[in-house]
Interface confidence: medium
């Protein structure tokens, strides 16, 4: 009789259902009714992560670092090497195939999220009485300038890009 | 009816040689694993040798390298080929007929009558 | 090689009444949500025949009044109402690690 359904950790082989291999291992043979699945373990720089019948293991992945890569995590058996960019740089994909640059908020804007290893910068605009005269992947917008408390009047207003200018009241003349 | 018939069981002496023979009629004997277990004379029951339908075999490390099992699916006939004997495979052997639902699932689902072997000098 | 102790080594049950026979494995027979365990049933110049495979399945033919329940290490098979044909021996046996093997067996009397 051929068995009808196989467990979770099986596959069906003709009339049998044979035991998948675990993880860190691949196929060599399929199981027999005398003779278990034949199992080996991954070489050095190969993995598989799941119950499987492979009869290959992956690869472990490169990090290159041409491409701004850098290793995260070793990979292990049944585990894939992890990759994460450089300082400075972020992954252009959600794969993290390869790094750039992390952006720079231009005069005008400021960093409303300081970069990581794999997003970019996240910047905004200066909403009013907030300004940013750099470029700058760190730079938050900064309050303009209150006269006032420093007992100065206010001479220039402020921008986006630019703050105000304070100077002594001038007093008139008689 | 499914009929499995052993014969070939005789006194032998140590280190003698003997071939055991399972005539089997009933059941499409191609399609199914067959196995030999046997019982000792202190009735405790041993797994001794498999077959596969597709010709593999399996035999526990106490019969290793001394004992071959082997099937003629055209005559319906399974065998045990026994060499350098001892005193300890002393037992009445029986061809049996496993079922396996998946590798590790095997039944043995029809029995022969068994076939004694003596070891002894 | 995993090691079935069977117990007791023998019992005698009134006619109508419930047999119990127990078999512990050296380790798990368990595997992927399956027990690998069978029970045969031996009468005195015959060949072993099979009442349960897989733990708790009834081997087609057999009557129900033979019951196998456990998992894992512990296995149990019942006979429930005994009868005069039930004397025999019974034995456990594990598929699910080569060698397969067999527990010692289990003589059952009828008073």
């Known amino acids: 009789e051929p068995a009808t359904a196989c467990g979770e950790k099986q596959y069906p082989v003709n009339s049998l259902c044979c035991d998948l291999c675990p993880p860190g291992q691949k196929l060599v043979n399929d199981c027999t009714e005398v003779s278990k699945t034949e199992c080996q373990s991954c070489g050095k720089g190969e993995f598989l992560s799941t119950w499987n019948r492979e009869k290959y293991c992956h690869e472990h992945r490169y990090c290159n670092p041409n491409l701004g890569l850098r290793i995260q995590s070793e990979g292990t058996l049944n585990t894939d090497t992890t990759c994460v960019c450089v300082e400075g740089q972020h992954c252009t994909s959600h794969t993290c195939e390869s790094c750039t640059p992390h952006s720079l908020c231009l005069p005008g804007f400021g960093v409303k999220q300081i970069a990581t290893g794999l997003l970019d910068t996240v910047c905004e605009p200066c909403p009013l009485g907030f300004f940013s005269n750099v470029s700058s992947a760190f730079e938050k917008c900064h309050r303009w300038t209150s006269c006032e408390r420093k007992g100065l009047v206010e001479q220039h207003v402020g921008t986006n890009k630019t703050d105000v200018v304070c100077g002594f009241q001038s007093r008139m003349r008689t | 009816e499914v009929k499995l018939v052993e014969s070939g069981g005789v006194l032998v002496k140590p280190g003698g040689s003997l071939k055991l023979s399972c005539a089997a009629s009933?059941?499409?004997?191609?399609?199914?694993?067959m196995s030999w277990v046997r019982q000792t004379p202190e009735k405790r029951l041993e797994w001794v040798a498999s077959i596969g339908s597709g010709g593999g075999t399996y035999y526990p490390d106490s019969v290793k390298g001394r004992f071959t099992i082997s099937r003629n699916n055209a005559r319906n006939i399974l065998y045990l080929q026994m060499s350098s004997l001892r005193s300890e495979d002393t037992a009445m052997y029986y061809c049996a007929r496993a079922y396996y639902r998946n590798h590790r699932g095997s039944v043995m689902d029809y029995w022969g009558q068994g076939t004694s072997v003596t070891v002894s000098s | 090689d995993i090691v079935l102790t069977q117990s007791p080594a023998s019992l005698a049950v009134s006619l109508g009444q419930r047999a119990t026979i127990s078999c512990k494995a050296s380790?798990?027979?368990?595997?992927?949500?399956?027990?690998?365990m069978n029970w045969y049933q031996q009468k005195p110049g015959q060949p072993p025949k099979v009442l349960i495979y897989s733990a708790s399945n009834l081997e087609s033919g057999i009557p129900a009044r033979f019951s196998g329940s456990g998992s894992g290490t512990d296995f149990t098979l019942n006979i429930h109402p005994v009868e005069e044909e039930d004397a025999a021996t019974y034995y456990c046996?594990?598929?699910?690690?080569?060698?397969?093997?067999f527990g010692g067996g289990t003589k059952l009397e009828i008073k």
């Open positions: 380790q798990t027979v368990d595997y992927d949500g399956d027990s690998y």
């Open positions: 046996q594990q598929s699910t690690e080569d060698p397969p093997t």
């Open positions: 009933g059941f499409t004997f191609s399609s199914y694993a």
